[in-house]
Amino acid sequence: QPSVSPGEPSPPSIHPAKSELIVRVGNEIRLLCIDPGFVKWTFEILDETNENKQNEWITEKAEATNTGKYTCTNKHGLSSSIYVFVRDPAKLFLVDRSLYGKEDNDTLVRCPLTDPEVTSYSLKGCQGKPLPKDLRFVPDPKAGITIKSVKRAYHRLCLHCSADQEGKSVLSDKFILKVRPAFKAVPVVSVSKASYLLREGEEFTVTCTIKDVSSSVYSTWKRENSQTKLQEKYNSWHHGDFNYERQATLTISSARVNDSGVFMCYANNTFGSANVTTTLEVVDKGFINIFPMINTTVFVNDGENVDLIVEYEAFPKPEHQQWIYMNRTFTDKWEDYPKSENESNIRYVSELHLTRLKGTEGGTYTFLVSNSDVNASIAFNVYVNTKPEILTYDRLVNGMLQCVAAGFPEPTIDWYFCPGTEQRCSASVLPVDVQTLNASGPPFGKLVVQSSIDSSAFKHNGTVECKAYNDVGKTSAYFNFAFKGNNKEQIHPHTLFTPRSHHHHHH
């Protein structure tokens, strides 16, 4: 019994003066609390607590369930205790079948003994199954058996308390351990689509998937910069004991333009939080925006290839696409495809492949596209660069020499005089008149240039060269002169070409 120095309040004394007492079932329990300031006796075992205001606690016929701790308390709040075992061969264990374990913590299997003198007090698996190899436990006859550091793997483990009584193994009623998992990571959240584009009045529905070790994970859809509670519907599944999945579906049945914004799916557990967002854009009607991938004015050399490429955004999806030239629709030579295979893709590519273009194939090429809401088009002006071609090379009645050349870009005509039989004509002759003949004619075709010089300027035998050139190449035509007396006579007009020139003859 406790002892204290005189003058200080002391704890009560209990008779019998023992810390433990063993009573046979059916016998009397008689406990006396000696204290001038006696207040009460309390009895505790498992789920039961009882009080008695009499200083003598008497149980005439003790039962196994009277096993437990008897505590006497005085008016100073000081107490003393005695533990009573009521030995009952028919009831070796008192049990409270509720058994919860928190992962990584210890838990108590509450199966105190009614007889402290039994041996091999331990845990056993149900139906003779072995306990997990790593399960460690510590027995205490008055409290039960503590399982150390509970693991997730012990969830739903069926066990018995066990002890040897007079050489025989006795089992308690079964316990089923329910393990509550520790959150060791944030929830895993994902969203059905990262962005949505809708027209007014269409339904917006987005699903967030939340995965965690238990259903106690918290989740919600939130609108960014708004406190309004959103309407959600849930579906959930357990894929095994510690693999929980929830689908939270947010729906706006008739979306409006002002519903546009960022929506966040937020989830948290005791470890931390995670979130994922989706963007909603609501437009009042559909649209098509076309972006040329090359300049809309295209210059291409005669005989070469060119690809006219556009990218375009279309919502809703495009229904009709076509390429047109001179009021004729291309049936082939073009392809149209989505920019990505992504479900939310609204960007597309259209390519028209023009091959071995001729000078006559310049002009306006138009791409047209439409969806259920709008039409859109874009035009490309294609110019075919051609080397000059000398169309005519004549001596006119009025003594003029005339050279007419066609090409694109507009050719430049230069004149040269070569005295005698020299091959190289270097002395340039200024033209009297230069005209662009079809400047007001149809666009995109070859440009025709006419240049004239006065032949009376030539006093000696020789050759006149008309040289037409542009960025693509050059062509020359020659006119030979011989003098007979005072008369100047055209002997042999003809064209000669450099290897890069196109053949053209006049006689």
């Epitope: 607590t49 509720s98 919860y100 928190k102 913590n105 329910k178 509550r180």
Partner: antibody
Framework: QVQLVQSGAEVKKPGSSVKVSCKAS????????LSWVRQAPGQGLEWMGG????????DYAQKFQGRVTITADESTSTAYMELSSLRSEDTAVYYC?????????WGQGTLVTVSS | DIQMTQSPSSLSASVGDRVTITCRAS??????LAWYQQKPGKAPKLLIY???SLQSGVPSRFSGSGSGTDFTLTISSLQPEDFAVYYC?????????FGQGTKVEIK
């Protein structure tokens, strides 16, 4: 013998909150779980959530998450259930019950009426 | 969440009758099933836990059986005090869910 005694009936306005208490006696409070189960008039039973006081954390049914808070005060052996943003369909008898899985002891119930 | 379906929703019987109520789970719940009795204006009372274990203090005329998805509560000989609503409840996974109830009435 274990007893669970709940606080009295409440009448609340929509949008407000209610906090119901459940005092346990005759048993060890902290080592047991305590759940809250509600029953709307003429309807069945619906588990809202539960707490194991010694673990300190609560489990909630998704339907009530964000709106219900379950707490426990070990010093007074009392559990509490607070339900916020009340609506008319929250009118029900709210029971506390011992356990997180099956429920061996029940409180007498607390009628919460939500009415404007 | 796991759905629990009870049948019948109500039944009429006489004192002394053998009464059987069934409960079906939407997925395997092993033996994590309890049965409760509720009388008007009272809290439910646990009768059976772990599908077939009789709760302390409950008369032996009540028994439970089943495993997996199909479960049965049997009252071997109906007594006047047994007229009540009976609920099944699964607790294999949280959230725990209840059946819609079976009302046992006097014929």
């Amino acid at each position: 013998q274990v007893q669970l005694v709940q606080s009295g009936a409440e009448v609340k306005k929509p949008g407000s909150s209610v906090k119901v208490s459940c005092k346990a006696s005759g048993g060890t409070f902290s080592s047991h779980a305590l759940s809250w189960v509600r029953q709307a008039p003429g309807q069945g039973l619906e588990w809202m959530g539960g707490i194991i006081p010694s673990f300190g954390t609560a489990d909630y049914a998704q339907k009530f998450q964000g709106r219900v808070t379950i707490t426990a005060d070990e010093s007074t052996s009392t559990a509490y259930m607070e339900l916020s943003s009340l609506r008319s369909e929250d009118t029900a008898v709210y029971y506390c019950a011992r356990g997180l899985y099956d429920f061996d002891y029940w409180g007498q119930g607390t009628l919460v009426t939500v009415s404007s | 969440d796991i759905q629990m379906t009870q049948s019948p929703s109500s039944l009429s019987a006489s004192v002394g009758d053998r009464v059987t109520i069934t409960c079906r789970a939407s997925q395997d719940i092993s033996q994590d099933l309890a049965w409760y009795q509720q009388k008007p204006g009272k809290a439910p009372k646990l009768l059976i836990y772990d599908a077939s274990s009789l709760q302390s203090g409950v008369p032996s005329r009540f028994s439970g059986s089943g495993s997996g998805t199909d479960f049965t509560l049997t009252i071997s000989s109906l007594q006047p005090e047994d007229f009540a609503v009976y609920y099944c409840q699964q607790y294999y996974y949280l959230p725990s869910t209840f059946g819609q109830g079976t009302k046992v009435e006097i014929k």
